[in-house]
Amino acid sequence: SASDYNSSELKTACRKHELYVSFQDLGWQDWIIAPKGYAANYCDGECSFPLNAHMNATNHAIVQTLVHLMNPEYVPKPCCAPTKLNAISVLYFDDNSNVILKKYRNMVVRACGCH
Amino acid sequence: SASDYNSSELKTACRKHELYVSFQDLGWQDWIIAPKGYAANYCDGECSFPLNAHMNATNHAIVQTLVHLMNPEYVPKPCCAPTKLNAISVLYFDDNSNVILKKYRNMVVRACGCH
């Protein structure tokens, strides 16, 4: 995940972090009527050897972790990404100013894992 | 994905990279009979604004990209992770030295995206 971050300290393990997103902050307040925002959350943290059960790692991620240990210059660690996502319902104006209620898939992170 | 890398230059966009994994290199040659290795591949690259169609981005990744632009110190970019994974069949010795043929899921990266 945070590929452009440099940190001299050990990062925490891959996990879900809370994040509230305000549609006003995104500049979407003129077309989204409701909600005003939502708990989107995000994934961040290290996917380091050994990958434990909490990390929901795929078989590929386990293999990639081992290859990274041997070839860190060439192959990155797996990354911390959503494993479960939920939808939210949004009330908004379409291009013709009609009010629409639509369910947007994959908007909320419920769980994270190493991929 | 390569969260512990520092790079002074622009990284290429999220994509699949070829990677052949030798079971001998992993130290698994004593229990895996066949194959000797396989094309595992891996995902790497930037998930930067704007996320184009090739990046198979989820709605959450699109939102997270916008939040990252506004708050890069707090929220990372989405990460480049597998979106399609394939299985491989492996012939191996179990703990009782029986020869087993088993299909291992999620071993090969077929496609990558921003998550």
């Epitope: 990274h68 240990l69 041997m70 070839n71 860190p72 210059e73 060439y74 | 390569a2 890398y5 520092n6 790079s7 002074s8 230059e9 990284k11 290429t12 030798s22 290199d25 130290g27």
Partner: antibody, heavy 118, light 107 residues
Framework: QVQLVQSGAEVKKPGASVKVSCKAS????????IHWVRQAPGQRLEWMGW????????KYSQKFQGRITITRDTSASTAYMELSSLRSEDTAVYYC???????????WGQGTLVTVSS | EIVMTQSPATLSVSPGERATLSCRAS??????LAWYQQKPGQAPRLLIY???TRATGIPARFSGSGSGTEFTLTISTLQSEDFAVYYC?????????FGPGTKVDIK
């Protein structure tokens, strides 16, 4: 044939910086990583950091984090290691070494002696 | 971090004799072990990799063996040019680490 040729010896004052170069020839520069290893007088070899010459990714030893910068110029097939805030214990021979995927350090530069003295 | 230890620290051998150098890893490193030779004022030179494979141009008198945590470098018949310091290095798990070296000197 593969060669890594390093810049010449340097004498620096405490607090100064040094930049050592490592020019590669005889192979495709961007297909390998360049590592930097140092050896203080009578000491064992100590890994400092690496750069993937293809994509520019770097990784530094925790010991040198914040003081070391490794860069490369692909057009010149040259890698550079800069060490800042030098102290007397940084007096050592600094080596660059090439590493391919799944391999050890197969070719080394001749070494650059850096002496830190007031 | 995997710690590499070497023994003996110094080995005194006469030219023409056999030299056996040992290297131990603090945990299993499969066969990902290399041996380097370093002469005074020179850079290390790769001798053996993958525990037992000789690098390009390395004479047959150098051989490597072992697996897991215990490794050996053998110089079957010591030549005058073989008196040097020998380092082992594991390249199985990052960070790759070197042993402290074994100095082979003339008896």
């Amino acid at each position: 044939q593969v060669q890594l040729v390093q810049s010449g010896a340097e004498v620096k004052k405490p607090g100064a910086s040094v930049k050592v170069s490592c020019k590669a020839s005889g192979y495709t520069f961007t297909s390998y990583a360049i590592h930097w290893v140092r050896q203080a007088p009578g000491q064992r070899l100590e890994w400092m950091g690496w750069i993937n010459a293809g994509n520019g990714n770097t990784k530094y030893s925790q010991k040198f984090q914040g003081r070391i910068t490794i860069t490369r110029d692909t057009s010149a097939s040259t890698a550079y290691m800069e060490l800042s805030s030098l102290r007397s214990e940084d007096t050592a021979v600094y080596y660059c070494a090439r590493r391919g995927f799944g391999e050890p350090f197969d070719y080394w530069g001749q070494g650059t002696l850096v002496t830190v003295s007031s | 971090e995997i710690v590499m230890t070497q023994s003996p620290a110094t080995l005194s051998v006469s030219p023409g004799e056999r030299a056996t150098l040992s290297c131990r890893a603090s945990q299993s490193i499969s066969s990902n072990l290399a041996w380097y030779q370093q002469k005074p004022g020179q850079a290390p030179r790769l001798l053996i990799y993958g525990t037992s494979t000789r690098a390009t141009g390395i004479p047959a008198r150098f051989s490597g063996s072992g697996s897991g945590t215990e490794f050996t470098l053998t110089i079957s018949t010591l030549q005058s040019e073989d008196f040097a310091v020998y380092y082992c290095q594991q390249y199985n798990i990052w960070p790759f680490t070197f042993g402290p070296g074994t100095k082979v000197d003339i008896k």
